[in-house]
């Protein structure tokens, strides 16, 4: 039986069960190395309270659709007069990068995962050349998730202070030059994620190889070498390689952009000081709510429920939005569709779409950004399941009793974008990360 | 305040079973993950079973097959099933309960004593 989703087969994945204090490792295409699971787990559970070990999934006993992935074990799990063996369930959706696989709940005989992740989409899209895994767990088992800063197309510009030369870099996967061809990355070869342009040529000096690693708490590093034989004429032998060290910094601050810290010999050693270094629930919430010592912030968007079945709306040109965000009030347009934004086409307000739903909500303060994702909406027709992110910008002398009102500022691959200028998304910071 | 109390230990022939409770107060139970583990004389403290706050189970290889751990929500209390006991199943059982936002919470200890 072939692989079911070749791209995630190079690498061993990690998910966590925090409330248990349990680690995954999962092998979808083989078994995972780990001698106390047996020579065929493909689902190992790592228990660190007791430092045991259990096979929870058997490569042997694969089965797969396109969207499901089950691993079963001969292990039997005592429910009453049944005859279940314990088993592993990945559920797989199209997302825009090969993604990370989450524990979502696990009962007596099943451990439940759910993957967003290029591999399950329909078109190939948002398919990268090279890709590896962006994200890691610490020591304490906290996750640590460079994702959202993977380019889809383009490319950081590294800050090198060289007249000469720049150097362009993407997170964890190849630089996309097609999709948005800019002018100095549009010479860069095909596969490579670090590009090195000098007047009018550009030189891969860096292609991923392996996953994110953590070195140190809240230092990441990610190393991109250049894979094949042909040495550059100007590395005095060498063969290139690029290290990206990801620092999450020791208070809340702005972004900053990569700086590159040494260079000798076609070797770059880059420092980027970002808050997505840092571990994810120091950045996010699955409320409307930043707050307390874990975040050093606090920010509550719930004023901006809409109550009574009123609706935010925003003009799209063709499209109407409406947005009910931080509660679980049904949009009327988008009748039993659990939607926070819906989306009614203005010529026929029959074709109406969710594009993001209520239950699917992730607020993010990062680098100063203050995020509110809805994901989870209706299907495109790449697989992709619609979302909208919506930026939020501070403005004490908002209108609507403060309150604002989203603007749609456009659409890129079925994900929905909004500006929003509210008093409620002045952020008050404390300062003990 | 915090507590665990076991309950149920005692003396048994081999081959004899008993019932360990272990009751909780203080806390959000079914939000804990419970464990028991049970310390022999003159050797270290072992782990014996986990029932996670979502309900997976697992056991230690030497008592799997003839222990059984579950839990009754409404009682706040985590029981051992042990079936088939062996003159080495002899030793102190002690529950645990452990939560992210709790550091863990041992009980007493109750005494089990498997002898002809």
């Known amino acids: 039986q072939a692989a079911p989703f070749p791209e995630l087969c190079s690498y061993t994945w990690e998910a966590v069960d925090t409330k248990n204090n349990v680690l995954y490792k999962i092998n979808i295409c083989g078994s995972v190395d780990i001698v106390q699971c047996g020579p065929s787990s493909a689902v190992c559970m790592h228990d660190l309270k007791t430092r045991t070990y259990h096979s929870v999934g058997d490569s042997v006993l694969r089965s797969a659709t396109r969207s499901l992935l089950e691993f079963n074990t001969t292990v039997s799990c005592d429910q009453q007069g049944t005859n279940h063996r314990v088993q592993s369930s990945i559920a797989f959706l199209c997302g825009k990068t090969l993604g990370t696989p989450e524990f979502v709940t696990a009962t007596e005989c099943v451990h439940y995962f759910e993957w967003r992740t290029t591999a399950a989409c329909k078109k190939d899209i948002f398919k990268a050349n090279k890709e590896v895994p962006c994200y890691v767990f610490d020591e304490e088992l906290r996750k640590h998730d460079l994702n959202p800063l993977i380019k889809l197309s383009g490319a950081y510009d590294v800050d090198d202070s060289d007249p000469d030369t720049s150097l362009f870099i993407n997170v964890c996967r190849d630089i996309d030059t097609l999709r948005d061809p800019g002018s100095q990355l549009r010479a860069c070869p095909p596969g490579t994620a670090a590009c090195l342009v000098r007047g009018h040529q550009a030189f891969d000096v860096g292609q991923p190889r392996d996953g994110l690693k953590v070195v140190r708490k809240d230092r990441l590093v990610l190393s991109y070498v250049r894979e094949e034989a042909g040495k550059l004429d100007f590395c005095d032998g060498h063969s290139p390689a690029v290290t990206i060290t990801f620092v999450c910094p020791s208070e809340r601050r702005e972004g900053t952009i990569p700086k590159l810290t040494a260079k000798s010999n076609c070797r770059y050693e880059i420092e980027w000081i970002t808050e997505y270094a840092c571990h994810r629930d120091y950045l996010e919430s699955k409320t409307c709510s930043l707050s307390g010592e874990q975040q050093d912030v606090s920010i509550d968007l719930t004023p901006l429920a809409q109550s009574g079945g009123s609706s935010y709306i925003s003009d799209g040109k063709e499209y109407l939005f409406y947005l009910n965000v931080c509660g679980e009030t049904e949009i009327q347009f988008c009748n039993k569709k659990q939607a926070a934004v819906c989306q009614v086409k203005k010529s026929d307000t029959s074709q109406v779409k969710a594009a993001g739903r209520y239950h699917n909500q992730t607020l993010r303060y990062s680098d100063g950004d203050l995020t509110l994702i809805y994901f989870g909406g209706d299907e495109c027709s790449s697989g992709f399941q619609r979302m909208s992110v919506i930026n939020f910008e501070c403005n004490k002398t908002a209108g609507n009793d403060g309150k604002g009102t989203p603007v749609f500022t456009g659409e890129v691959d079925c994900t929905y974008f909004f500006t929003w200028d509210t008093e409620y998304a002045c952020v008050h910071h404390h300062h003990h990360h | 305040q915090v507590q665990l109390q076991e309950s149920g230990g005692g003396l048994v022939q081999p081959g004899g079973s008993l019932r360990l409770s272990c009751a909780a107060s203080g806390i959000i139970f079914s939000d804990n993950r419970m464990d028991w583990y049970r310390q022999a004389p003159g050797k270290q403290r072992e782990w014996v079973a986990t029932?996670?706050?979502?309900?997976?189970?697992t056991y230690a290889d030497s008592v799997k097959g003839r222990f059984t751990i579950s839990r009754d929500n409404t009682k706040n209390t985590v029981y051992l099933r042990m079936n088939s006991l062996k003159p080495e199943d002899t030793a102190v059982y002690y529950c645990?309960?452990?939560?992210?936002?709790?550091?863990?919470?041992w009980g007493q200890g109750t005494q089990v004593t498997v002898s002809s």
């Open positions: 029932l996670a706050s979502y309900g997976w189970k």
């Open positions: 645990k309960a452990s939560s992210p936002v709790l550091n863990d919470i």
